[in-house]
């Protein structure tokens, strides 16, 4: 035990951290909505598109009430990590037609990465179980055609939009329990 500490060094309180995580998620949701609209304008979607490698939607808004903080954050982080990988893959293998979505796709990737970092820090501050942020995952196969890349982009942005919408609701609800 030593002398008293020097001036305090202050880092954000978990509740303040949750507030800023909600703001970041909302901002990412707006980005995703805008990018999905941009994609629909350039390449209209013929019906719903899905990609087997994407995570299934965590749950309906109605089921949110029963959720516990660790489960929400763990699931959200796992799903967003999957979407981050898919966005990276889309930028790398999506083909020349999707180059028209840059630099917005790059900004989306950076913000998604930032949100994942924020969630990791929040889980650390709360001392919740922390699955590895970068678990090994099988590589994604390149799209079979240019149209395949566009279909994949529709599926990725659509799924991310639903996930982020669920995330905002979930995080706001969790804030009341912290």
């Amino acid at each position: 035990p030593g002398p008293p500490p020097g001036p305090p060094r202050v880092s954000p309180d978990p509740r303040a951290e949750l507030d800023s995580t909600v703001l970041l998620t909302r901002s990412l949701l707006a980005d995703t909505r805008q990018l999905a609209a941009q994609l629909r304008d350039k390449f209209p979607a013929d019906g719903d598109h899905n990609l087997d490698s994407l995570p299934t939607l965590a749950m309906s808004a109605g089921a949110l009430g029963a959720l516990q903080l660790p489960g929400v954050l763990t699931r959200l982080r796992a799903d967003l990590l999957s979407y981050l990988r898919h966005v990276q893959w889309l930028r790398r293998a999506g083909g020349s037609s999707l180059k028209t979505l840059e630099p917005e796709l790059g900004t989306l990737q950076a913000r998604l990465d930032r949100l994942l970092r924020r969630l990791q820090l929040l889980m650390s501050r709360l001392a919740l179980p922390q699955p590895p942020p970068d678990p090994p995952a099988p590589p994604l196969a390149p799209p079979s055609s240019a149209w395949g890349g566009i279909r994949a982009a529709h599926a990725i942005l659509g799924g991310l939009h639903l996930t982020l919408d669920w995330a905002v609701r979930g995080l706001l609800l969790l804030k009341t329990r912290l």
Epitope: Q120, S124, R125, L126, Q130
Partner: antibody, heavy 114, light 111 residues
Framework: EVQLLESGGGLVQPGGSLRLSCAAS????????MHWVRQAPGKGLEWVSV????????YYADSVKGRFTISRDNSKNTLYLQMNSLRAEDTAVYYC???????WGQGTLVTVSS | QSVLTQPPSASGTPGQRVTISCTGS?????????VHWYQQLPGTAPKLLIY???ERPSGVPDRFSGSKSGTSASLAISGLRSEDEADYYC???????????FGGGTKLTVL
């Protein structure tokens, strides 16, 4: 201002028990995971145990597993460490710390000696 | 032996820039967990210096910066001052231990 004040340290014989307490103030205690970290004289930092913000998750270093128990009382803003079957190698300054850990107390000295 | 490896000592003259490395493995830094850095001045408790690889808590001068790549991280101190003489520790969560692990510490001497 954030304050973490450890107490309960002292001299104990090998095989004996001690209960450390850490009184927290100046922050929302119930929103933070809490750690115990120790530092043997002249050595580096060694993590001992962590408890989640609501007490539902507890983890321990292998060196103390089965001997030490971490707990918290959010209504009293207090963290505890029950230490049983103490060994000479448990001699250290024990710090309580909050969050990442972001904030640390000044520590309490535990000496295990016959 | 510590799970994270740091050089036991480092030194520099006032005004210089020094870096301290921290090497981990695939169960901690390499698994993607953030690295945090602590400063322990002689006879005092550790203080958080850098969190989440490169974030500074308010009150920490911008002379201190952190970075992370692969399984290692580093702390840089520019414009070295005599009051920076302290022990510096890195830490990261470890999946195999279900808790944070610390480096062995680096004693920084300002010549």
């Amino acid at each position: 201002e954030v304050q973490l004040l450890e107490s309960g340290g002292g001299l104990v014989q090998p095989g004996g028990s001690l209960r450390l307490s850490c009184a927290a103030s100046g922050f929302t205690f119930s929103s933070y995971g809490m750690h115990w970290v120790r530092q043997a004289p002249g050595k580096g930092l060694e993590w001992v145990s962590v408890i989640s913000y609501d007490g539902s998750y507890k983890y321990y270093a292998d060196s103390v597993k089965g001997r030490f128990t971490i707990s918290r009382d959010n209504s009293k803003n207090t963290l505890y460490l029950q230490m049983n079957s103490l060994r000479a190698e448990d001699t250290a300054v024990y710090y309580c710390a909050a969050g990442v850990p972001d904030y640390w107390g000044q520590g309490t000295l535990v000496t295990v000696s016959s | 032996q510590s799970v994270l490896t740091q050089p036991p000592s480092a030194s520099g003259t006032p005004g210089q820039r020094v870096t301290i490395s921290c090497t981990g493995s695939s169960s901690n830094i390499g698994a993607g967990y953030d690295v945090h850095w602590y400063q322990q001045l002689p006879g005092t408790a550790p203080k958080l210096l850098i969190y989440s690889n490169n974030e500074r808590p308010s009150g920490v001068p911008d002379r201190f910066s952190g970075s992370k790549s692969g399984t290692s991280a580093s702390l840089a101190i520019s414009g070295l001052r005599s009051e920076d003489e302290a022990d510096y520790y890195c830490a990261a969560w470890d999946i195999s231990l279900n808790g944070p692990v610390f480096g062995g510490g680096t004693k920084l001497t300002v010549l």
